[in-house]
Amino acid sequence: MAVTACQGLGFVVSLIGIAGIIAATCMDQWSTQDLYNNPVTAVFNYQGLWRSCVRESSGFTECRGYFTLLGLPAMLQAVRALMIVGIVLGAIGLLVSIFALKCIRIGSMEDSAKANMTLTSGIMFIVSGLCAIAGVSVFANMLVTNFWMSTANMYTGMGGMVQTVQTRYTFGAALFVGWVAGGLTLIGGVMMCIACRGLAPEETNYKAVSYHASGHSVAYKPGGFKASTGFGSNTKNKKIYDGGARTEDEVQSYPSKHDYV
């Protein structure tokens, strides 16, 4: 029962986590810029993995994809790759774990097969969660190290001036969604791995075996280790595998040559 609960909970937690990773990957608020007041309208910029958006105080929002950008840094491509790998692994893990669930019967699938599938899905969830956490952390590090503050001024050769708008890049909501989602997927994966141990078939324990004595109707239950080693309550010093299961006092003594001396 506990194994089924652990497996089921692990599945649900992983499902929520992977949904969160997908949401984070699609969100535009990976990095946000402090709202700056243009004399015409207040403008709020935010950027995701795939596009950049601007929202005006009027509520108007415009987003543009990065395909027009001349060069995307390798780090951004790496973050994209990590998030996609996380989603793919998580999706496969979910598919495998559905068939591995103890509460679902598919044909004559043995517990050992379910245990293996549970372990496989658990490992996939762990790797998926780690990919998401890594991706979000790499992006956060990029913001902190390279793009936190932007204040430089420069001039064009045409006589007009180009001034960098003073904007501060801060962590967007998607980063926190990604961290939490990655953590949930990781936890779900660990729970699946724990559940796998409970699903695995244990070695057969041979406990009580009845021995019938030849010529006697006495049933004998072996005393196990304690009896065979002289420990425990075997006060009468029974012979363990004696066919008749009798004490030494009851052993029939056959006549010897010394009896007649």
Partner: nanobody
Framework: EVQVVESGGGLVQPGGSLRLSCAAS????????MGWYRQAPGKQRELVAG???????RYADSAKGRFTISRDNAKNTVYLQMNSLKPEDTAVYYC?????????????????WGQGTLVTVSA
């Protein structure tokens, strides 16, 4: 390189009309706001009119009812139609654009100014 270039300035009689144009060019990712500012001799630079991507407009009190700003987002161009011009409208008119360059990521927003075009209102 990103730049904005103004055109359409010149000498005009009081009560006359003039249409200024400003085109942004270069590696532009997007433009948030485009506007016109003016600076009369010995005075501070002031906003005449501005327009955002979403169509939000703002006019200086002295320009309301006489000037109209419009924008062509596809061409990254802003226009200022000036009617009923007065001698006090004489100034150097500067184009301003808040834009994002397509040369870096994350997208950096720049405030780009033109070199200005002179508008003289005189009889």
């Amino acid at each position: 390189e990103v730049q904005v270039v103004e055109s359409g300035g010149g000498l005009v009689q009081p009560g006359g009309s003039l249409r200024l144009s400003c085109a942004a060019s270069g590696s532009i990712f997007s433009i948030n706001v485009m506007g016109w500012y003016r600076q009369a001799p010995g005075k501070q630079r002031e906003l005449v009119a501005g327009i955002s991507t979403g169509g939000t407009t703002r006019y200086a009190d002295s320009a309301k009812g006489r000037f109209t700003i419009s924008r062509d987002n596809a061409k990254n161009t802003v226009y200022l139609q000036m009617n009923s011009l007065k001698p006090e409208d004489t100034a150097v008119y500067y184009c301003n654009a808040d834009l994002a360059t397509a040369t870096s990521w994350p997208v950096r927003y720049l405030e780009v100014w033109g070199q200005g075009t002179l508008v003289t209102v005189s009889a």
